[in-house]
C-alpha cells in the first residue's frame, strides 16, 4: 500500500509523459490523477517505467475502477497487463478482438500464463462461442490452443471456425478431442468435392468412425501412412484388407514398416492370413486359414 501524501508544489502531472519516470512511487501516487491516466493509457507503454512504478499506476486504476476496467483502458494496458492477476481479469468484459490481440501481443513468445488463459476464457464466454476470427487469432499466438480445450469446450466451436485450423494446431490433440472436432470438420467441409474434401479433413481423421473410413476407401484418396497411424484403433479394426488397400492406395506398402505398431499390429491380428497374403507385403500374424472367426462386437452391443 502506498501512503496518501500531498503532491509537492509544481509536480502535479498535466499529462502522462517521460518526466514521470523520475517520480518516486509516492509522488506518482500523489501527483498523477487516475482519470488522466485512464484517458492516456496508450502513452504508458512508450515510457520506460520500473516495475515498482507500474505497480503504483495499476493501484490507481484499481481505485478508479473497483468493478473492473472498461475496455477503452484494457485495450491500451500494454505491459501493465503483465501486472494483472487472474482475479483482476475476471472482472473485465472484453468484447473486441483488437483488444484481445493487443494483450496477447504483450505476452508473445511466452507460455500461456494464467492471466492469458483467464483473458481468453472471458473473451470466448463473452462471445458465446469460439468463432473463426477468434480461433484464427488464438492459434496464431498459441498453436496448441485448440488442444488445450476440454471436449466440452470444443463442443461449442462452430463448424465455420474449423476453416481456421491448421494441421499443426491439432498435433497435441488426444482422441477425445478429435472425436468432437471431426464431426465439426465434416460439417464445415461438406460442400467440397471429393479430393479437396480429403485434403481438408485429413488432419481430423483421428476422430473418424469406421463407417466414414469405409466410405473414404471408395474415393481413391491414397491416405498416407502418417495419417493412417493416427486413426482410432477401434475404427480401423473392422476394416477389411481390401478396404485398407483402397484407403492407402500406393501407400499400402508402408504397412510392412509399421506392422509392430498400433493400429496396424492390432488390425493384422484381426485379418485372415490368406487375405493379408494378397497384399504381397509379407505381413504375418493374421488368423490362420481354416480357423473360425467369431465377431463378438454384436454380442457386446447386446449385453
Amino acid at each position: 500500500e502506498v501512503e496518501k501524501t500531498a503532491c509537492p508544489s509544481g509536480k502535479k502531472a498535466r499529462e502522462i509523459d517521460e518526466s514521470l519516470i523520475f517520480y518516486k512511487k509516492w509522488e506518482l501516487e500523489a501527483c498523477v490523477d487516475a482519470a488522466l491516466l485512464a484517458t492516456q493509457m496508450d502513452r504508458v507503454n512508450a515510457i520506460p517505467f520500473t516495475y515498482e512504478q507500474l505497480d503504483v499506476l495499476k493501484h490507481k486504476l484499481d481505485e478508479l475502477y473497483p468493478q473492473g476496467y472498461p475496455e477503452s483502458v484494457i485495450q491500451h494496458l500494454g505491459y501493465l497487463f503483465l501486472k494483472m492477476s487472474p482475479e483482476d481479469i475476471r472482472k473485465w468484459n472484453v468484447t473486441s478482438l483488437e483488444t484481445l490481440k493487443a494483450l496477447l501481443e504483450v505476452n508473445k513468445g511466452h507460455e500461456m500464463s494464467p492471466q492469458v488463459a483467464t483473458l481468453i476464457d472471458r473473451f470466448v464466454k463473452g462471445r458465446g462461442q469460439l468463432d473463426k476470427d477468434t480461433l484464427d487469432t488464438l492459434t496464431a499466438f498459441y498453436p496448441g490452443y485448440l488442444c488445450s480445450l476440454s471436449p466440452e469446450e470444443l463442443s461449442s466451436v462452430p463448424p465455420s471456425s474449423i476453416w481456421a485450423v491448421r494441421p499443426q494446431d491439432l498435433d497435441t490433440c488426444d482422441p477425445r478431442q478429435l472425436d468432437v472436432l471431426y464431426p465439426k470438420a465434416r460439417l464445415a467441409f461438406q460442400n467440397m468435392n471429393g479430393s479437396e474434401y480429403f485434403v481438408k479433413i485429413q488432419s481430423f481423421l483421428g476422430g473418424a468412425p469406421t463407417e466414414d473410413l469405409k466410405a473414404l476407401s471408395q474415393q481413391n484418396v491414397s491416405m498416407d501412412l502418417a495419417t493412417f497411424m493416427k486413426l482410432r484403433t477401434d475404427a480401423v479394426l473392422p476394416l477389411t484388407v481390401a478396404e485398407v488397400q483402397k484407403l492407402l492406395g500406393p501407400h499400402v506398402e508402408g504397412l510392412k514398416a509399421e506392422e509392430r505398431h498400433r493400429p496396424v499390429r492390432d488390425w493384422i491380428l484381426r485379418q485372415r492370413q490368406d487375405d493379408l497374403d494378397t497384399l504381397g507385403l509379407g505381413l504375418q500374424g493374421g488368423i490362420p486359414n481354416g480357423y473360425l472367426v467369431l465377431d463378438l462386437s454384436m454380442q457386446e452391443a447386446l449385453s
Partner: antibody, heavy 122, light 106 residues
C-alpha cells in the same frame, strides 16, 4: 425396417422446458448422425442442430444456441432434444432425422421420425 | 443470414414435367438436397448432393445445381407427386431450408 420413433405430443407453459425423445428401432447396432428439424403450423422446415454418433459432438443453429441441448443414450439407441425457455413461437412439430447414407461428406436426412407436436400455451 | 428462395407454387398436368427452382447466393458452390412432404407426413429425401437419388426414389426425380440456382425436375409427373418440396443447403454454421414449393398435379 429401420424406424425412428418419437415421444408423444406435449403441452407446455411459456418459460418451461420440453424434452423430446427419438428412439431408433431396427438396425440399432449402427449409430448415425441425428439432426432435429422443426415445423411451425402451416410454415416451412427449420433446422435446429445435429449430434454425432457417439454423442460427444453437437452443433446447434445460432438461433437456438443456449436454449437447445441434444444428447444421446447409446445403450438405448435414443437421442434427446431439450428446448428451454419456451415461448408461444416454439409451438411446432419437432422431427428427428438420421443421416444413414453412405456419403462421407454429406448429412442428408434420409430416415425421419413421425414428429412430435409441442404446443406452448398459457 | 443465408436465404433460399423457392416459388410458392407450381402446377403441372399428369405426365408433364415439373421444374422447381431454388435460388441462393452462389448456391452452385454448395451441395443442395431436396425433400418432399405430403400433408400430415414427415419429409422424405428425394435428392442429395445436387443430383443423387436415394434408393427407393423413382427415376423421374432428378436434380441439378449451378450458379445461383438449384433445380428439382419431376419428369412424367404423377398424382402421387403432389406435395410440398423444400430445398436445403449448408451455409457457414447452419442448414438452411428453402421457403417451400407446393406442387399441384392438375
Amino acid at each position: 425396417e429401420v424406424q425412428l420413433v418419437q415421444s408423444g405430443a406435449e403441452v407446455k407453459k411459456p418459460g418451461a422446458s420440453v424434452k423430446v425423445s427419438c428412439k431408433a428401432s431396427g438396425d440399432t447396432f449402427k449409430r448415425y448422425y441425428v439432426q432435429w428439424v422443426r415445423q411451425a403450423p402451416g410454415q416451412g422446415l427449420e433446422w435446429m442442430g445435429i449430434i454425432n454418433p457417439s454423442g460427444v459432438s453437437t452443433t446447434y443453429a445460432q438461433k437456438f444456441q443456449g436454449r437447445v441441448t441434444m444428447t444421446r443414450d447409446t445403450s438405448t439407441s435414443t437421442v434427446y432434444m431439450e428446448l428451454s425457455s419456451l415461448r408461444s413461437e416454439d409451438t411446432a412439430v419437432y422431427y428427428c432425422a438420421e443421416s444413414r447414407g453412405s456419403g462421407y461428406n454429406y448429412f442428408a436426412m434420409d430416415v425421419w421420425g413421425q414428429g412430435t407436436l409441442v404446443t406452448v400455451s398459457s | 443470414s443465408y436465404e433460399l428462395t423457392q416459388p410458392p407454387s407450381v402446377s403441372v398436368s399428369p405426365g408433364q414435367t415439373a421444374s422447381i427452382t431454388c435460388s441462393g447466393d452462389k448456391l452452385g458452390d454448395k451441395y443442395a438436397s431436396w425433400y418432399q412432404q405430403k400433408p400430415g407426413q414427415s419429409p422424405v429425401l428425394v435428392i442429395y448432393q445436387d443430383n443423387r437419388r436415394p434408393s427407393g426414389i423413382p427415376e423421374r426425380f432428378s436434380g441439378s445445381n449451378s450458379g445461383n440456382t438449384a433445380t428439382l425436375t419431376i419428369s412424367g409427373t404423377q398424382a402421387m407427386d403432389e406435395a410440398d418440396y423444400y430445398c436445403q443447403a449448408w451455409d457457414s454454421d447452419t442448414y438452411v431450408f428453402g421457403t417451400g414449393t407446393k406442387v399441384t398435379v392438375l
